[in-house]
């Protein structure tokens, strides 16, 4: 039975050329996380594996940094980075939990950041 919930940073905006942290947090479940996948639309950005650690997809190596925690840092943002991002938690025995974040990259020098939450 899937009892868990995923909190995310929600809808966020950032300035072109800047960086942003994408974060998800799985709570309310005793399931064990074995892997977290980060995806942009249908493209795999990175994998954080409980045993093997981080793997960043080669095409994103220059602009994606692992962490903090199970989160992902996107750097040197471009307008093309605007879109949906997904954290996919693989858990035993619950299965997969998916969180959604929408990122808008603004040309303007005044990018309004959505509310951030801190992972305890």
């Amino acid at each position: 039975m899937m009892t868990g919930t995923i909190e995310t940073t929600g809808n966020i905006s950032a300035e072109k050329g800047g960086s942003i942290i994408l974060q998800c947090h799985l709570s309310s479940t005793t399931a064990q996380v074995t892997q977290v996948n980060w995806e942009q639309q249908d493209q795999l950005l990175a994998i954080c594996n409980a045993d093997l650690g981080w793997h960043i997809s080669p095409s994103f190596k220059d602009r994606v940094a692992p962490g903090p925690g199970l989160g992902l840092t996107l750097q040197s943002l471009t307008v093309n980075d605007t879109g949906e991002y997904f954290c996919i938690y693989h858990t035993y025995p619950d299965g997969t939990y998916t969180g959604r974040i929408f990122l808008e990259v603004l040309e303007s020098s005044v990018a309004e950041h959505g509310a951030r939450f801190q992972i305890p």
């Epitope: 005793t30 074995t34 892997q35 996948n37 045993d51 025995p93 299965g95």
Partner: antibody
Framework: EIQLVQSGSELKKPGASVKVSCKAS????????MNWVRQAPGQGLEWMGW????????TYAQGFTGRFVFSLDTSVSTAYLQISSLKAEDTAVYYC???????????????WGQGTMVTVSS | AIRLTQSPSFLSASVGDRVTITCRAS??????LAWYQQKPGKAPKLLIY???TLQSGVPSRFSGSGSGTEFTLTISSLQPEDFATYYC????????FGGGTKVEIK
């Protein structure tokens, strides 16, 4: 080599307690969930539940609550099964089994202990 | 709980035979199914996971297929060391095992 080594056979009287150990080696113990499986003589496999090796949180299958306790000592990469108030019907082989695979598509019990025979008899 | 029904419970076959074992789930489990082989006095051994993926080191005469509620394990040419009991297991939710299929020498 990845392996799970369990403690030896036990002969116990009804009402007594037993603690079975399962020592892991060759992999990162806290990265893989651990399960316990019972097999009564001449019977099939019965999933007893599992323990989150990262948090120590146990989950028990129906019929295995109350007298059964799963625990860990991560410092020695060992999982434990304790059964209290033993009954004749607890006579069985008890296995520990690791969940292998990283994504949900790959989950399966890929490494098993050799089994511990627990006999309950007066 | 999801129930798994294996058939047949017993199967008599000869070396070289093609053997098929069926596992039916009481509700859809996608491809979250594994097959194990168990010999007397030994622990079960993983043969196949994700319904059709062969575990490393397992001979290619073993194959699995199916999704949803119906699954099969096939041994293309039975070898002397294949006489054993076979179990299916679902991992769609809390794991459960099928009742087992004992493959005996004819």
């Amino acid at each position: 080599e990845i392996q799970l080594v369990q403690s030896g056979s036990e002969l116990k009287k009804p009402g007594a307690s037993v603690k079975v150990s399962c020592k892991a080696s060759g992999y990162t113990f806290t990265s893989y969930p651990m399960n316990w499986v019972r097999q009564a003589p001449g019977q099939g496999l019965e999933w007893m539940g599992w323990i989150n090796t990262n948090t120590g949180n146990p989950t028990y299958a129906q019929g295995f609550t109350g007298r059964f306790v799963f625990s860990l000592d991560t410092s020695v990469s060992t999982a434990y099964l304790q059964i209290s108030s033993l009954k004749a019907e607890d006579t069985a082989v008890y296995y520990c089994a690791r969940v292998g695979g990283y994504s949900v598509d790959e989950y399966a019990f890929d490494v098993w202990g050799q089994g511990t025979m627990v006999t309950v008899s007066s | 709980a999801i129930r798994l029904t294996q058939s047949p419970s017993f199967l008599s076959a000869s070396v070289g035979d093609r053997v098929t074992i069926t596992c039916r789930a009481s509700q859809g489990i996608s491809s979250y199914l594994a097959w194990y082989q168990q010999k007397p006095g030994k622990a079960p051994k993983l043969l196949i996971y994700a319904a059709s993926t062969l575990q490393s080191g397992v001979p290619s005469r073993f194959s699995g297929s199916g999704s949803g509620t119906e699954f099969t394990l096939t041994i293309s040419s039975l070898q002397p060391e294949d006489f054993a009991t076979y179990y299916c297991q679902q991992l769609n939710s809390y794991p459960t095992f099928g009742g087992g299929t004992k493959v005996e020498i004819k």
